[in-house]
């Protein structure tokens, strides 16, 4: 079936090697001829010619294909010229001949086992395969082709990408360790629970791809979508030469959705226990899972064991807010935390949603800060608050919001990073509500906003002349 891959080979006598320890040669004859008419002879320099045993197969609408598989591994030698010629024994004529090097006619068999599953990030796909001839895998390069599996559109976009074996897994980067230096102190954090869905579409050849031996990671796919994928290999052209082998049989994989869609938020209050919460779906039950992974080059735990995240009672603090499911688990500070939420709908269909991985120190939620105030002069307030965490005072940023009585819109202020207070100019003879919240956003610790402090009611004094 791989013969078509040799179409560009203009030689009438075509030869290929699967593992560089074997050699198959074949040629086609349009004209029917009895068995024994042809002989394929071969010889290495200064050696006696030998005949390669021929088999033949009928080719519909063409004639006969004559095939020889070299019978002995010792007859297949690299880096020596091999002289081959086809002889019409009956007519005692040479029909065709060629000289080749076995090391330049590789046509590798496709990877024999290919497994695919969601990676550690939403929109990521982890692929691993087994090389039929492991001893030559170092001398091969791989190409992946994949596309969205859309039953309605069988001609969906296809991406073909060369796998860069020299690149290791992107999981090396600390997950979402966004530098806070070039942001305002309280800029929206690039935290797992606030990441917007990726816009990279598989129809664009922009998806990142990395590999290590028999595995690679694709990113930039659409979370929640189904994909098909195939793999093939080619000699690297440096040590060994040849052509691209055939594509492996397609495998399909369903990527987990992005847990952003469920409003997943995880946090720790004590750097030991992690709580995760997500919006409860209508007419569905849900369950959280987690696992820890070490920071390393390419993932060894390609098939992680997800542990149950212990369920908490469902909360419904207000009718306006959606009902949340919560669960908690004990964590460690030396590993990356991965979260998966499984939602089971009434008919029993299970949908998986993957959170973006994070370190525990990236999910520290501060206690609600206490806000104190005093009016220095009419409408002029002096505000003060205690750092909820003295150990991270320089990494804590705050947001203060206030609104006039009867108003719905809030004005939000962001004091400088690490500030313990500030002043606020309000209108005299007015009533206000003030709230404060805190968040870690430094090089060591990050996390989500705390809840807003209870509203502090302020009534500013009448103006007085100095």
């Amino acid at each position: 079936q791989d013969v078509s891959l040799l179409a560009s080979d203009s030689e009438p006598l075509k030869c290929f090697s699967r593992t560089f320890e074997d050699l198959t040669c074949f040629w086609d004859e349009e004209e029917a001829a009895p068995s024994g008419t042809y002989q394929l002879l071969y010889a290495y320099p200064r050696e006696k010619p030998r005949a390669c045993p021929l088999s033949s197969q009928s080719m519909p609408h063409f004639g006969t294909r004559y095939v020889c598989q070299f019978p002995d591994q010792e007859e297949v030698r690299l880096f020596f010229p091999l002289h081959l010629w086809v002889k019409n024994v009956f007519l005692n004529q040479t029909r065709t001949q060629r000289v080749l090097f076995v090391d330049s006619v590789g046509l590798p068999a496709p990877p024999s086992i290919i497994k695919a599953m969601g990676g550690s990030q939403p929109g990521e796909l982890q692929i691993s395969w087994e090389e039929p001839a492991p001893e030559i895998s170092d001398f091969l390069r791989y190409e992946l082709r994949y596309g969205p599996r859309d039953p309605k559109n069988s001609t969906g976009p296809t991406v073909i990408q060369l796998i860069a074996t020299e690149t290791c897994c992107p999981a090396l980067q600390r997950p979402h360790s966004a530098s806070a230096l070039d942001q305002s102190p309280c800029a929206q954090p690039t935290m797992p629970w606030q990441d917007g869905p990726k816009q990279t579409s598989p129809s664009r050849e922009a998806s990142a791809l990395t590999a290590e031996g028999g595995s690679c990671l694709i990113s930039g796919l659409q979370p929640g979508n189904s994909y098909w994928l195939q793999l093939r290999s080619e000699p690297d052209g440096i040590s060994l030469g040849g052509s691209w082998g055939s594509w492996s049989l397609p495998v399909t994989v369903d990527l987990p959705g992005d847990a952003v869609a469920l409003g997943l938020q995880c946090f720790t209050l004590d750097l030991k226990n992690v709580t995760c919460q997500w919006q409860q779906q209508d007419h569905a039950s849900s369950q959280g899972f987690f696992y820890h992974s070490r920071a390393r080059c390419c993932p060894r735990d390609r098939y992680p064991i997800w542990e149950n995240c212990e369920e908490e009672e469902k909360t419904n603090p207000g009718l306006q807010t959606p009902q949340f499911s919560r669960c908690h688990f004990k964590s460690r500070n030396d590993s990356i935390i991965h979260i998966l939420v499984e939602v089971t709908t009434a008919p029993g269909t299970v949908h998986s949603y993957l959170g973006s991985p994070f370190w525990i120190h990236q999910a520290v939620r501060l206690p609600t800060p206490n806000l104190h105030w005093r009016e220095i002069s009419s409408g002029h307030l002096e505000l003060e608050w205690q750092h909820p965490s003295s150990w991270a005072a320089q990494e804590t940023c705050y947001q203060l919001r206030y609104t006039g009585e009867g108003h719905q819109d809030w004005k939000v202020l962001e004091p400088p990073l690490g500030a313990r207070g500030g002043t606020l100019e309000l209108r005299p003879r007015s009533r206000y509500r003030l709230q404060l919240r805190a968040r870690l956003n430094g090089p060591t610790y990050q996390g989500p906003w705390s809840s807003w402090s209870d509203p502090t009611r302020v009534e500013t004094a009448t103006e007085t002349a100095w």
Epitope: E29, E30, E31, A32, A33, P34, S35, G36, T37, S56, S58, G63, T64, V89, F90, L91, N92
Partner: antibody, heavy 120, light 106 residues
Framework: EVQLVESGGGLVQPKGSLKLSCAAS????????MNWVRQAPGKGLEWIAH??????????YYADSVKDRFSISRDASENILFLQMNNLKTEDTAMYYC???????????WGQGTSVTVSS | QIVLTQSPAIMSASPGEKVTISCSAS?????MYWYQQKPGSSPKPWIY???NLASGVPARFSGSGSGTSYSLTISNMEAEDAAAYYC?????????FGGGTKLEVK
Amino acid sequence: EVQLVESGGGLVQPKGSLKLSCAASGFSFNTYAMNWVRQAPGKGLEWIAHIRSKSNNFATYYADSVKDRFSISRDASENILFLQMNNLKTEDTAMYYCVRQGGDFPMDYWGQGTSVTVSS
Amino acid sequence: QIVLTQSPAIMSASPGEKVTISCSASSSVSYMYWYQQKPGSSPKPWIYRTSNLASGVPARFSGSGSGTSYSLTISNMEAEDAAAYYCQQYHSYPTTFGGGTKLEVK
């Protein structure tokens, strides 16, 4: 169904000429090698001429007994095989068969034959 | 060229009898081919590649041999088997036929 129908035989004087034809049907004529085989009365079979397929440039081969006197050719568009016989001898008297070369048999389909008599 | 010698040239056998026709080559050949010819008809392909029966050939026929010695055998002769049998080599140019064996029914 493969069919080979010879024609053109008859009585001819020694040193005379005759052209035999063989109309082929039921197969892809140009992809097969073709032969002429003859059988003298009461004798065995003798191969006399061979012409290869189009992919082998219609190369021709002859038995020593007819070389330089007989010529095999084919009309690729009309699916006809010819045998031009010149300088005929009495020993050329025989039944002449048009035969297709096959994969299992060197000669897998035979025509019904056409009779050639060389006599003065 | 390779000369094929068939023996016997003529033979007769009774129905049910075992018949063997030999074909000897002047030099070694890979395969032998056999054809059957009845009076007034053109030859029919009968056995290919030494031992394979052509389509429609009764199973009482068999072929064997190697190198320079080949044979066609009829395990139990039937009246319809009366015919001339020719061996053919296609090992080296030119192809040659044996002189034929005429088989008659007693």
